[in-house]
C-alpha cells in the first residue's frame, strides 16, 4: 500500500519545512486518493475489458453515483464556496458505500482498496472542519446502504466487473472536480 500523505521520504528529508495548511493537506490527500484509484483501475483494466466499454454500455447501468452538476456551485459558472463544499462532503459520504463494495473486488491490490477507503474517511473529516454549514450535509441512511451493498454483491460477475469499473471512474471524476473547485476556495 502507498505511504499516507505526510509520511513520504521527501517529508522525512525536510524536517524544517513549514507545516501544511488545511488547504494543502486536503489537496495532498485528494492526490493521494487519486493515485490509489489509478492503481485500482490498472488492475481492473488488466483483468477485464470494461475500460474499453462504450459510454452507452456504461450509461445503461443504473448506479446512482454522485456527480457534479451546475447547481452544486462547484463549476466556474455559479461558483459558490459553501454550496460546493456541502456537495463535495455529501458526495463523498454517498461514495462510502461504493468504496465498501470495492473492498472484496481486488486480488493484488487489496491493501490499495483499503487505503482508498480509509483515506476518503480522513478526507471527509478534513473537509467537515472546513465547512461552516454542517447542518446542510445529509448523511446516507445506513439501512438503505446495507440493502444497496447486498444488491450489488448479488450481481453476476460481468455486472460486478462493470460496477467496479464505474465506481472507480466516477469516484475519480468526482474527486477531480472537487479538487478543482477546492483550489478556487
Amino acid at each position: 500500500a502507498p505511504v499516507p500523505p505526510g509520511e513520504d521520504s521527501k517529508d522525512v528529508a525536510a524536517p524544517h519545512r513549514q507545516p501544511l495548511t488545511s488547504s494543502e493537506r486536503i489537496d495532498k490527500q485528494i492526490r493521494y486518493i487519486l493515485d490509489g484509484i489509478s492503481a485500482l483501475r490498472k488492475e481492473t483494466c488488466n483483468k477485464s475489458n470494461m475500460c474499453e466499454s462504450s459510454k452507452e454500455a456504461l450509461a445503461e447501468n443504473n448506479l446512482n453515483l454522485p456527480k457534479m452538476a451546475e447547481k452544486d456551485g462547484c463549476f466556474q459558472s455559479g461558483f459558490n464556496e459553501e454550496t460546493c463544499l456541502v456537495k463535495i462532503i455529501t458526495g463523498l459520504l454517498e461514495f462510502e458505500v461504493y468504496l465498501e463494495y470495492l473492498q472484496n473486488r481486488f486480488e493484488s491490490s487489496e491493501e490499495q482498496a483499503r487505503a482508498v477507503q480509509m483515506s476518503t474517511k480522513v478526507l471527509i473529516q478534513f473537509l467537515q472542519k472546513k465547512a461552516k454549514n454542517l447542518d446542510a450535509i445529509t448523511t446516507p441512511d445506513p439501512t438503505t446502504n446495507a440493502s444497496l451493498l447486498t444488491k450489488l454483491q448479488a450481481q453476476n460477475q460481468w455486472l460486478q466487473d462493470m460496477t467496479t469499473h464505474l465506481i472507480l471512474r466516477s469516484f475519480k471524476e468526482f474527486l477531480q472536480s472537487s479538487l478543482r473547485a477546492l483550489r478556487q476556495m
Epitope: S177, R183, Q184
Partner: nanobody, 124 residues
Framework: QVQLQESGGGLVQAGGSLRLSCTVS????????MGWFRQAPGKEREFVAD????????WYADSVKGRFTISRDNAKNTMYLQMNSLKPEDTAVYYC?????????????????WGQGTQVTVSS
Amino acid sequence: QVQLQESGGGLVQAGGSLRLSCTVSGRTFSTYAMGWFRQAPGKEREFVADINWNSDNLWYADSVKGRFTISRDNAKNTMYLQMNSLKPEDTAVYYCAVDSYGVGGGKPEYYDSWGQGTQVTVSS
C-alpha cells in the same frame, strides 16, 4: 516525460484574433487536465484558462472571460486557445501546461509539464 509544443502566436492589432494550439506527445493525453498561462516581461506567470479531460469543466481568469475560449481535441492530442477582441495588455508569452492528476487550477505549481511558450504581441 510529456512534450508540449505551442504554436499560433504572432503580432496582431488590438481588436483582432489569434488561435493558439498546444500539441502534446503521449498516449494518456485524454486523461490530463490542461491549462494556458501567460507571462509579460517583468511580471509573474499568470493563469489564463484551464480545461479538464472531457471538456466539461472550464475555468477562465476574469481578465479574459468572454473573450478567450479554451478547448481540446483528444483525438489530435491538442488543446486550443481562441483569443478574440485582443487588447495590448494581452501581450505576453503564452505557455501551455498539463496536470497528470487531471485537475488543473490557477497556480503554476499545479502543473507538472510545460511547453516552451509562444509570443503574442497586440499592438494598439
